[in-house]
Interface confidence: low
């Protein structure tokens, strides 16, 4: 049966329990979750994970008695772990796995649970001992019973059957929201010193939440929601509101890359590239998060939350829930995938969405527009050719429009004034009889990649200026530093004079403004993205690619980027794999990204690593990869021993033999060497990379990847006839780096 | 905007194969399942299957495993489908139709214009 | 396979009057706490055209005259007021299990 995060069965109990036999099978990746409860006003069972280990509270009467899993075994590995608690004449057993864990006299006191057993959570129950107990499972149990009773019969609704494929679902899967009252609930979202959330969305919902947090201070919140097809986020702090929206339609069934950024001096929301974000001179503040984190709908309290709110978000939109996906999700940069979530509702693995590169076809609607922001305008000629009446004043024959259009050229993340030449007017005004400051401009489309900034009072707001504005030079232009080598700006021009005048110019005609975008040359710069600190096992060689470092350059491809390694090139520590021994002391990003590069530790303290990257004209400054060895730690997981017949062959797998060791995101290479003479057979290992009818050939020594690969066993070669079954003790000893350890 | 377009009318002999092809743009062919329906004349429809294009992989009506085969050119963006051993029960106008890329609903919401098989000796 | 069967056959409605389609399926074809049930409208030699997705949501573009309802096994396209414009083929299909099946159409005439 499938738990969420907050569901429950609830199994009645007629007469006090005098002996217990309970036997559980659960999965969870979640190191919190309520597995069990037998509840009566002070009698109690409780059995629950806590930091991923098997905690047991018995209280009998005025006895309490606590039992639990040893902290080095973790149980909130995903993967099933049996848990079966016997309570008989006086002594309570606990053993996990088969193996016994603990085990202590308890009073010979029957268990008095009038209010029933609870599966997987407590439901609303609010006994005084529940208090600080673990959240809902959000996970499988496989198999529950006591006394030989199935507790997993009836299911509610909410518990589904079978093991949910989201539990299991790596962060690579995509969150899919099946609505209509999806909700995944994640650990809160902090945004003390700045806060990032980033997806890809697929959906047509128009309208939608997609994320929320709520604040500390009550009505404190973060709201990203889709509202009529667009992105929009509200911040509320107790100072204020601060409401944007993205003119980016996104509910048109395609993936697009949404990232919203926050931090104490503004807010950010971009999608597919086109950003949209407040002034520098925000309202936000630091918002203490409380609660989780919740994406692609609302609980009750979120809901509430909105619709007390002065937006007026109504009842209807924030009952609804996302129809659509969410991928390649992150939180202020680490990934997150339906593993992660604390709970979830009507929530399926996967949207059918390829990890595949972005291809051009993705973006084609948008290339026809080149210049245009992202919606696009209505195909005009612009202005529209004005036709003035006649008995005109003769400046005004042949006259079609007012001024004549030079593109403004900006640097990229530069400013460039708005100057005569610009909005050049086509006529002499003072024979029109026209003042500067009658001519008047308004805004009625911003630029994708910058803003015009007006220093008039109170024209910002307004968005307006005047003729007079532009050759005193009070308007500029200031670019956001993005790549785009075009823009535009939308300008309604008319004229507010009294006199006689083409009616066009007192309606307003319609100009673009074109800008174009000298680019600049952005350094690269190199990010960590899971922090400047690596561990590597001592004696060992570790893998460094993209996971480890990479390089950010906003107008470079990955191909125009070459890494060196700053330091003294002898002992250098970086190697290419196919070149053992040599040390790399320049590499290139496609041989980064393609994993050719390794770190091989030799001894003694690990060497940091100084880096740099250039694009061929700018270096990014040198970035350090702080290093740590680390002595190898080998544990035995397995050793189970074989069983087979006489003569016969049997494979030695992971379930028999397989070791665990201490290194971090490393795949070490784990030797185990034979260290005493077989008595009644040997030890094989087969050629050709295991080939379908390779060879066997006896081996002294073979690598836990051959485990892994079925290409080790034990073959019997005791032709002897015995009376008994014989036992061959095979000695082994594990060697990881330099460490060994002996006597397997 | 999304446009599927289809190949032309095709006239073939009992016993022989046809190709037809569902040009698509407008939109990322490669994340999105593209369906094929079968329309006899004066009849409903029928759901032949499916193909997602970035992997090749693909979905049949049972009753039409054996008879068509859907694959799809990612480099041209074009899906195509092939119906072998002809016979006059598969004279039809076969559609190509996207399906949407969401979790749900795998409806289908742009159509080819339709190719029209006609099997004749 | 799930099985959809449309009543009626064929239906002639004055302009301006309600139009009501059934469709009824062989099991249900709900999931998710959603109905995967749509309803598609074919006007001669064109393809078929979306109307409503889930049972009840209507497709961008699509008059507010037309409205889907129904969960489980039944389910009902309403037009209202029909227009001249509305004279086609009706199918329902689901998609809660492959294979994909359609109803087998209602042929709608106009008054």
């Known amino acids: 049966a499938s738990f969420f995060g907050e569901n429950h069965l609830e199994v009645p109990v007629a007469t006090a329990l005098t002996d217990i036999d309970l036997q559980l099978q659960f999965s969870t990746s979640q190191p919190e979750a309520l597995l069990l409860l037998a509840a009566g006003p002070a009698d109690h069972l409780l059995l629950q994970l806590y930091s991923g280990r098997l905690q047991v509270r018995l209280v009998l009467g005025q006895e309490e008695l606590r039992l639990q899993t040893p902290a080095e075994t973790l149980l909130s590995d995903s993967i099933p772990h049996t848990v079966v608690l016997t309570v008989v004449e006086g002594w309570a057993t606990l053993s996990v796995d088969g193996f016994l864990n603990a085990s202590s006299a308890v009073p010979g006191a029957p268990l008095e649970v009038p209010y029933g057993l609870f599966v997987g959570g407590t439901g609303t129950l609010g006994l005084p001992y529940l208090r600080g107990t673990s959240r809902p499972l959000r996970g499988c149990l496989h198999a529950a019973t006591l006394n030989g009773r199935s507790l997993l019969r009836p299911l509610t609704p909410d518990v589904h059957e079978g093991c949910a494929e989201e539990f299991s679902a790596s962060d690579d899967v995509a969150l899919g929201f099946s609505g209509p009252h999806s909700l995944a609930a994640f650990p809160a979202w902090g945004t003390q010193d700045e806060g990032t959330l980033e997806f890809t969305l697929t959906t047509q919902s128009r309208q939608a939440p997609l994320a929320f947090q709520a604040g500390g201070r009550r009505g404190d919140f973060i709201y990203v929601d889709i509202f009529e097809g667009h992105l929009r986020a509200v911040v509320e702090k107790g100072q204020g509101t601060v409401l944007l929206h993205n003119s980016v339609p996104v509910a048109d069934g395609q993936p697009h890359e949404v990232s919203v950024h926050i931090n104490a001096h503004r807010l950010e929301i971009s999608v597919d590239q086109y950003p949209t974000h407040t002034s520098n001179r925000g309202v936000l503040s630091y918002l203490e998060p409380r609660g989780s984190l919740l994406l692609g709908g609302l609980d009750a309290e979120a809901s509430r939350h909105l619709q007390e709110h002065r937006l007026g978000l109504t009842p209807e939109a924030t009952n609804a829930s996302l129809l659509g996906c969410m991928e390649d999700l992150s939180v202020n940069g680490q990934r997150r995938g339906l593993r992660e979530a604390l709970l979830t509702r009507n929530m399926a693995a996967g949207c059918r969405l390829e990890e595949e590169e972005y291809e051009d076809d993705a973006y084609g609607h948008y290339e026809a527009f080149s210049t245009l922001a992202p919606e696009a305008w209505p195909a005009m000629e612009l202005p529209e050719p004005c036709v003035p009446e006649p008995g005109l004043p003769p400046v005004f024959a042949n006259f079609t429009q007012l001024l004549t259009i030079s593109p403004l050229v900006v640097a990229e993340g530069g400013t460039a004034w708005l100057e005569w030449r610009h909005v050049q007017p086509t006529l002499d005004l003072m024979e029109a009889e026209l003042r500067k400051s009658q001519v008047l401009f308004s805004v009625t489309r911003g630029a994708r990649h910058g803003e015009l900034e007006l220093d008039i009072p109170g024209a910002q707001a307004r968005k307006m200026f005047t003729l007079l504005d532009v050759v005193n030079r009070k308007a500029r232009f200031i670019h956001d530093g993005s790549e785009d080598t075009s823009d535009q700006l939308v300008l309604e021009v008319s004229v507010t004079a009294r006199v006689p005048m083409p009616s066009c110019l007192r309606r307003g005609q319609t100009y673009l403004l074109p800008i174009q975008v000298n680019p600049v040359n952005d350094p690269p710069h190199i990010i960590f993205p899971h922090g400047s600190l690596m561990v590597i096992l001592e004696h060992t060689q570790k893998p460094l690619g993209p996971e480890v470092f990479q390089a950010y350059d906003p107008d470079s491809a990955c191909e125009g980027l070459t890494f060196q390694v700053l330091g003294t090139s002898s002992g250098l520590p970086v190697e290419r794999r196919d070149q053992p021994g040599e040390p790399a002391t320049e590499f290139s990003c496609r041989e980064l990204e393609a994993g050719s590069l390794v770190y091989v530790h030799r001894g003694g303290p690990a060497q940091d690593l100084t880096f740099r990257v250039s694009d061929g004209l700018q270096a990014s400054p040198p970035a350090t990869l702080k290093v740590v060895a680390i002595r190898p730690a080998i544990q035995i997981h397995r050793s189970t021993g074989l069983r087979l017949a006489q003569g016969s062959a049997m494979p030695i797998l992971p379930a028999n033999l397989s070791v665990e060791t201490n290194a971090v995101g490393q795949d070490v290479s784990v030797l185990f060497r034979v260290t005493g003479a077989l008595q009644f057979g040997e030890l094989q290992k087969q050629g050709a990379g295991g080939v379908e009818g390779a060879e066997w050939w006896a081996t002294q020594a073979f690598h836990q990847r051959d485990v892994e690969q079925g290409r080790v066993r034990y073959l019997s070669t005791d032709p002897q006839h015995h009376a008994y079954d014989t036992v061959e003790n095979l000695a082994l000893e594990v060697q990881v780096g330099q460490e060994i350890l002996s006597n397997l | 905007q999304v446009q599927l377009q289809q190949s032309g009318p095709e006239l073939v002999k009992p016993g022989a194969s046809v190709k037809i092809s569902c040009k698509a743009s407008?939109?990322?062919?490669?994340?999105?399942?593209m369906n094929w329906v079968k329309q006899r004349p004066g009849q409903g429809l029928e759901w032949i299957g499916r193909?997602?294009?970035?992997?090749?992989?693909?979905n049949y009506n049972g009753k039409f495993k054996g008879k068509a085969t859907l694959t799809a050119d990612k480099s041209s963006s074009t899906a195509y489908m092939q119906v072998s051993s002809l016979t006059s029960v598969d004279s039809a106008v076969y559609f190509c139709?996207?399906?949407?890329?969401?979790?749900?609903?795998?409806?289908?919401?742009?159509w080819g214009q339709g190719t029209s098989v006609t099997v004749s000796s | 396979n799930i099985v959809l069967t449309q009543s009626p056959a064929s239906l002639a409605v004055s302009l301006g009057q309600r139009a009501t389609i059934s469709c009824r399926a062989s099991?249900?074809?709900?999931?998710?706490?959603?109905?995967?049930m749509h309803w598609y409208q074919q006007k001669p030699g064109q393809p078929p055209k979306l109307l409503i997705y889930?049972?009840?949501n209507l497709e961008s573009g699509v008059p507010a005259r037309f409205s889907g309802s129904g969960s489980r096994t039944d389910f009902t396209l309403t037009i209202d007021p029909v227009e001249a414009d509305d004279a086609a083929t009706y199918y329902c299909?689901?998609?809660?299990?492959?294979?994909?099946?359609f109803g087998s159409g209602t042929k709608l005439e106009i008054k």
């Open positions: 889930l049972a009840s």
């Open positions: 099991e249900s074809v709900d999931s998710y706490g959603n109905s995967f």
């Open positions: 193909i997602y294009p970035g992997d090749g992989d693909t």
């Open positions: 139709a996207r399906g949407n890329t969401v979790v749900v609903p795998y409806t289908m919401d742009y």
């Open positions: 299909q689901q998609n809660n299990e492959d294979p994909l099946t």
């Open positions: 407008g939109y990322a062919f490669s994340r999105s399942w």
